[in-house]
């Protein structure tokens, strides 16, 4: 991470970076197209999942861990 600060601290997993283990189950939201890694500025974007970047739209998208849902994998999946 760069030499910067956030205040107050945002809680969340920085999932999808080296050394981290995530299970890809659900894509939220579902989009087609080319994906790349997310900019590191989004390392806390996906709460319980892995971030990927929709290149054409220049937007982050989350692949949720099992049992989680929502655009940022912020909700427990009650149907899991």
């Amino acid at each position: 991470s760069g030499n910067s600060t956030r205040s107050p601290e945002t809680n969340g997993l920085s999932c999808g970076y080296p050394g981290e283990n995530c299970t890809a189950t659900t894509v939220q939201p579902k989009r087609k197209g080319h994906f790349s890694r997310c900019p590191k500025q989004y390392k806390h974007y996906c709460i319980k999942g892995r971030c990927r970047f929709v290149v054409a739209e220049q937007t982050p998208s989350c692949i949720c861990d099992e049992g989680y849902t929502g655009a940022r994998c912020e909700r427990v999946d009650l149907f899991y």
Epitope: S1, N3, S7, P39, Y42, Y45, Q58, T59, P60, R72
Partner: antibody, heavy 121, light 107 residues
Framework: QVQLVQSGAEVKKPGSSVKVSCKAS????????ISWVRQAPGQGLEWMGG????????VYAQKFQGRVTITADESTSTAYMELSSLRSEDTAVYYC??????????????WGQGTLVTVSS | DIQMTQSPSSLSASVGDRVTITCRAS??????LNWYQQKPGKAPKLLIY???NLQSGVPSRFSGSGSGTDFTLTISSLQPEDFATYYC?????????FGQGTKVEIK
């Protein structure tokens, strides 16, 4: 057409504070990240910090942490940058700039006209 | 912080010349890089986003390329209005950082 209109030039004493405003029109103010970028005379561009939509809060460059506060008033579509404990090295043109993204800080596609802040005793 | 280094710092060129400016990041930033043009007394103007995408309204003589750590801005045929200072900027990580600028002057 998006427009960012900044407040006028300021002359400040060392140790004092300055608050620069940036009023947006022609777009959805709350959806986009507003950053502040400064440029000292004859120098390059320096990002100070910005409000990040998905965080709902400001992020600051470490260099300015504790001295700068960036806020936004959605009711008036106006962003503010307050810099305290001013010193002569803070003499610069201060720009507000809108990020092209409604998520984070990406490219700065719209800029204010700049506000010259002169710090002198 | 991610350091952005531009080269050259300045260059002299003539109208019609092909001009190339390079920008190097201190670590890989994928293609999370933008280019701006700034004229004296004016705010910067976005030219290229995401390394190679031309911003709407920008003439097609401007192009960008590169990925990882090395990037290039090319002006295929320099026009009188292109004499300005050009900056690269990374948006991979906070804090956002700019190159020191490249001033394109008339030869």
């Amino acid at each position: 057409q998006v427009q960012l209109v900044q407040s006028g030039a300021e002359v400040k004493k060392p140790g004092s504070s300055v608050k620069v405003s940036c009023k947006a029109s022609g777009g959805t103010f709350s959806s986009y990240a507003i950053s502040w970028v400064r440029q000292a005379p004859g120098q390059g561009l320096e990002w100070m910090g910005g409000i990040v939509p998905w965080m709902g809060e400001a992020v600051y460059a470490q260099k300015f942490q504790g001295r700068v506060t960036i806020t936004a008033d959605e009711s008036t579509s106006t962003a503010y940058m307050e810099l305290s404990s001013l010193r002569s090295e803070d003499t610069a043109v201060y720009y507000c700039a809108r990020s092209s993204s409604t998520y984070g800080i990406h490219a700065f596609d719209y800029w204010g006209q700049g506000t010259l802040v002169t710090v002198s005793s | 912080d991610i350091q952005m280094t531009q080269s050259p710092s300045s260059l002299s060129a003539s109208v019609g010349d092909r001009v190339t400016i390079t920008c190097r990041a201190s670590q890989s930033i994928s293609n999370f890089l933008n280019w701006y043009q700034q004229k004296p007394g004016k705010a910067p103007k976005l030219l290229i986003y995401a390394a190679s995408n031309l911003q709407s309204g920008v003439p097609s003589r401007f192009s960008g390329s590169g990925s990882g750590t090395d990037f290039t801005l090319t002006i295929s045929s320099l026009q009188p209005e292109d004499f300005a200072t050009y900056y690269c900027q990374q948006y991979d990580d906070f804090p956002m950082t700019f190159g020191q600028g490249t001033k394109v002057e008339i030869k």
